[in-house]
């Protein structure tokens, strides 16, 4: 039975040219995290595997940095980076948990963090 919940940084905004940390946290379960995928709807950004370490997709290598922790840092942001990001936690024995973050990249300096939210 899956008892865990994913807490994410929720809806966030950042300035064009800046950087942002995408962060998820799995709680309320003793399941072992064996892999975390960072994805957009149509492409994989990065994977952190407990045995193999980090893998960054070649199309993001220049501006994605692993961490902190199981999170992901996006750099040199463009307006095209606006959209949904998913953290997919592969766990044993629970299975797969997913969190969602919506990032808006702004032209001006009005970027500020939104509220936190949970996906069960």
């Amino acid at each position: 039975m899956m008892t865990g919940t994913i807490e994410t940084t929720g809806n966030i905004s950042a300035e064009k040219g800046g950087s942002i940390i995408l962060q998820c946290h799995l709680s309320s379960t003793t399941a072992q995290v064996t892999q975390v995928n960072w994805e957009q709807q149509d492409q994989l950004l990065a994977i952190c595997n407990a045995d193999l370490g980090w893998h960054i997709s070649p199309s993001f290598k220049d501006r994605v940095a692993p961490g902190p922790g199981l999170g992901l840092t996006l750099q040199s942001l463009t307006v095209n980076d606006t959209g949904e990001y998913f953290c997919i936690y592969h766990t044993y024995p629970d299975g797969t948990y997913t969190g969602r973050i919506f990032l808006e990249v702004l032209e001006s300096s009005v970027a500020e963090h939104g509220a936190r939210f949970q996906i069960p």
């Epitope: 994805e39 709807q41 592969h90």
Partner: antibody, heavy 118, light 107 residues
Framework: QVQLQESGPGLVKPSQTLSLTCTVS?????????WNWIRQPPGKGLEWIGY???????RYNPSLKSRVTISVDTSKNQFSLKLSSVTAADTAVYYC???????????WGQGTLVTVSS | DIQMTQSPSSLSASVGDRVTITCKAS??????VAWYQQKPGKAPKLLIY???YRYTGVPSRFSGSGSGTDFTLTISSLQPEDFATYYC?????????FGQGTRLEIK
């Protein structure tokens, strides 16, 4: 439990437009996920055609992009495939499928055979 | 596009046998590979995702392994209901692509 069901003509003439609909039950297609079309020519492998996401964004296979349109009818909880200028090479079983965030496909319709022939 | 090449294309085996099907990607896909089982006239069924994670309800005799470009689906002890065609799929980048299939037949 989500269920998907394809429907549409089983026979299309060459140069015409193939039109199929996928009716989804047990889940609102505007709530989440991406809704895909995948095809399989007789006796051959699977080919991903494209998707429409719950928010209306589309992504198509570049090999078919110039001929493909995927759209949604929210009132009927359906999404549709249109493939223009068909030839015999488009004869296939067409499946609709729901993608997981990680881009694997846990949920499929039963498939519908479309034959392109005059 | 990333090409997925399966081998063998067909395989004969007996109930109780251990069977291995391989899939080779044309470029590094890390662990982003899924496996499906398809029976005649039916839709594919998801068995494995992210190279080694069994989907809900899939029997433990099915296992996946591999990373980079080389992946394996293993059935530890074939059951009568396992005779089918198996496909690998890369879920690394669009367009998502499938192998050509491996047909598993009764010997």
């Amino acid at each position: 439990q989500v269920q998907l069901q394809e429907s549409g003509p089983g026979l299309v003439k060459p140069s015409q437009t193939l039109s199929l609909t996928c009716t989804v039950s047990g889940y609102s297609i505007t709530s989440d996920y991406a809704w895909n079309w995948i095809r399989q020519p007789p006796g051959k492998g699977l080919e991903w055609i494209g998707y429409i996401s719950y928010s209306g964004n589309t992504r198509y296979n570049p090999s078919l992009k110039s001929r493909v349109t995927i759209s949604v009818d929210t009132s009927k909880n359906q999404f549709s495939l249109k493939l223009s200028s068909v030839t015999a090479a488009d004869t296939a079983v067409y499946y609709c499928a729901r993608k997981y965030y990680g881009s694997w496909f846990p949920y499929w319709g039963q498939g519908t055979l479309v034959t392109v022939s005059s | 596009d990333i090409q997925m090449t399966q081998s063998p294309s067909s395989l004969s085996a007996s109930v109780g046998d251990r069977v291995t099907i391989t899939c080779k990607a044309s470029q590094d896909v890390f662990t982003a590979v899924a496996w499906y089982q398809q029976k005649p006239g039916k839709a594919p069924k998801l068995l494995i995702y992210s190279a080694s994670y069994r989907y809900t309800g899939v029997p433990s005799r099915f296992s996946g392994s591999g990373s980079g470009t080389d992946f394996t689906l293993t059935i530890s002890s074939l059951q009568p209901e396992d005779f089918a065609t198996y496909y690998c799929q890369q879920h690394y980048s669009t367009p998502w692509t499938f192998g050509q299939g491996t047909r598993l037949e009764i010997k």
